[in-house]
């Protein structure tokens, strides 16, 4: 089998063997090496010499195999836009940002550019759990049987109703979706409308 060509090598059909790590240089009609992530082109290739790469300076990066002559400047996450940093910029990766707690992404252009406050969920509901935090505004769902939520809040969760018996008390009023069970001392009389027996 013939040895594989090593850049730079001639290409008549304007395509290169390895599209990720090589690129076509039309002036010389040759395939040259791209520079790996974290580097940039410090000297372009010629027919007799391959691309020369150099490491990105501090506070700059290139994320992909490239033939860029500069590195991209690291940008901080903009708190005015509701963003916070989850991973710092490195020579190989831009700063990773996300929406601050209690916010969701309202504008997206390849990445989130602007976050807004999550809307409140009213009493008796909670925000549906999302696979990814900050991806969208709250979708409020009712509390399930045996659970309640008594505030207007973007993040409060439905909680189980209290069991009065565990505190040596009895139930004065059952819990609802918006309120916990009301417990009372067993010696206090029940209001007339609450009297009766409870069976499973």
């Amino acid at each position: 089998s013939q040895p594989q060509a090593v850049p730079p090598y001639a290409s008549e059909n304007q395509t290169c063997r390895d599209q990720e790590k090589e690129y076509y240089e039309p002036q010389h009609r040759i395939c040259c090496s791209r520079c790996p992530p974290g580097t940039y082109v410090s000297a372009k290739c010629s027919r007799i010499r391959d691309t020369v790469c150099a490491t990105c300076a501090e506070n700059s990066y290139n994320e992909h195999w490239n033939y860029l002559t500069i590195c991209q400047l690291c940008r901080p996450c903009d708190p005015v836009m509701g963003l916070e940093e989850i991973a710092p910029c490195t020579s190989k990766r831009k700063t990773q940002c996300r929406c601050q707690p209690g916010m969701f992404c309202a504008a997206w252009a390849l990445e989130c550019t602007h976050c807004e406050l999550l809307s409140d969920c009213p009493p008796g509901t909670e925000a549906e759990l999302k696979d990814e935090v900050g991806k969208g505004n709250n979708h409020c769902v009712p509390c399930k049987a045996g659970h309640f939520q008594n505030t207007s809040s973007p993040s409060a969760r439905c909680q189980p109703h209290t069991r009065c018996e565990n505190q040596g008390l009895v139930e004065a009023a059952p819990g609802t979706a918006q309120s916990d069970t009301t417990c009372k001392n067993p010696l206090e009389p029940l209001p007339p409308e609450m009297s009766g027996t409870m069976l499973m």
């Epitope: 399930k144 049987a145 045996g146 659970h147 189980p160 109703h161």
Partner: antibody, heavy 124, light 106 residues
Framework: QVQLVQSGAEVKKPGASVKVSCKAS????????INWVRQATGQGLEWMGW????????GYPQKFQGRVTMTRNTSISTAYMELSSLRSEDTAVYYC?????????????????WGQGTLVTVSS | SYELTQPPSVSVSPGQTASITCSGD??????AFWYQQKPGQSPLLVIY???KRPSGIPERFSGSNSGNTATLTISGTQAMDEADYYC?????????FGGGTKLTVL
């Protein structure tokens, strides 16, 4: 780690009673309900009731009321399930399982972990 | 009394997605729980409160619950997932189990 260890297999005659034990470790015994679930060979799971180890209060479905008694000994972190007036259809594996927090309503809990199961055979 | 209905069996090829349903009157108003049971073993909690996964349960297990139906979904099913699966819910303070579904990985 949280663990429930049950007593060994039992063989009983019809009309007799059986008492299965379930020893808890790795957590505060009085803070969580103990539930009992049974499973006849090749059949599904059948819930038999709950017990609050803190108060001793219990809840049984209608099917088992009058025949099942759930008790506990908090000093040794052990729950018991006694089934009386045994018949052949009570032959099954009996499981104990930790339920929800005793301070919250029964219907807020789930069963985790489970004991290893106790086979009770009812045969004349 | 409250009842939960499951299909007796579901078959799936390795790597494919398996869906097991559990239906009951207004089940979406209650929390659904799912248990896996392999032959000769005790049941194991795999999903609680409709969609939450206990620690140690692989990400391929997921759940949903709305209307009258709760669904357990196993994506990228593996041979080791072959087992019986039971749904469970509470009708006030009474525990109710579905009849169980045997998942066969072909």
């Amino acid at each position: 780690q949280v663990q429930l260890v049950q007593s060994g297999a039992e063989v009983k005659k019809p009309g007799a009673s059986v008492k299965v034990s379930c020893k808890a470790s790795g957590y505060t015994f009085t803070s969580y309900d103990i539930n009992w679930v049974r499973q006849a060979t090749g059949q599904g799971l059948e819930w038999m009731g709950w017990m609050n180890p803190n108060t001793g209060n219990t809840g049984y479905p209608q099917k088992f009321q009058g025949r099942v008694t759930m008790t506990r000994n908090t000093s040794i972190s052990t729950a018991y399930m006694e089934l009386s007036s045994l018949r052949s259809e009570d032959t099954a594996v009996y499981y104990c399982a930790r339920g929800g927090l005793t301070m919250k309503v029964v219907g807020a809990g789930w069963f985790d972990p489970w004991g290893q199961g106790t086979l009770v055979t009812v045969s004349s | 009394s409250y009842e939960l209905t499951q299909p007796p069996s579901v078959s799936v090829s390795p790597g494919q997605t398996a869906s097991i349903t559990c239906s009951g009157d207004k089940l979406g108003d209650k929390y659904a729980f799912w248990y896996q049971q392999k032959p000769g073993q005790s049941p194991l909690l795999v999903i609680y409160q409709d969609k939450k996964r206990p620690s140690g349960i692989p990400e391929r297990f997921s759940g949903s619950n709305s209307g009258n139906t709760a669904t357990l979904t196993i994506s990228g099913t593996q041979a080791m997932d072959e087992a019986d699966y039971y749904c469970q819910a509470w009708d006030i303070s009474t525990g109710v189990f579905g009849g169980g579904t045997k998942l066969t990985v072909l």
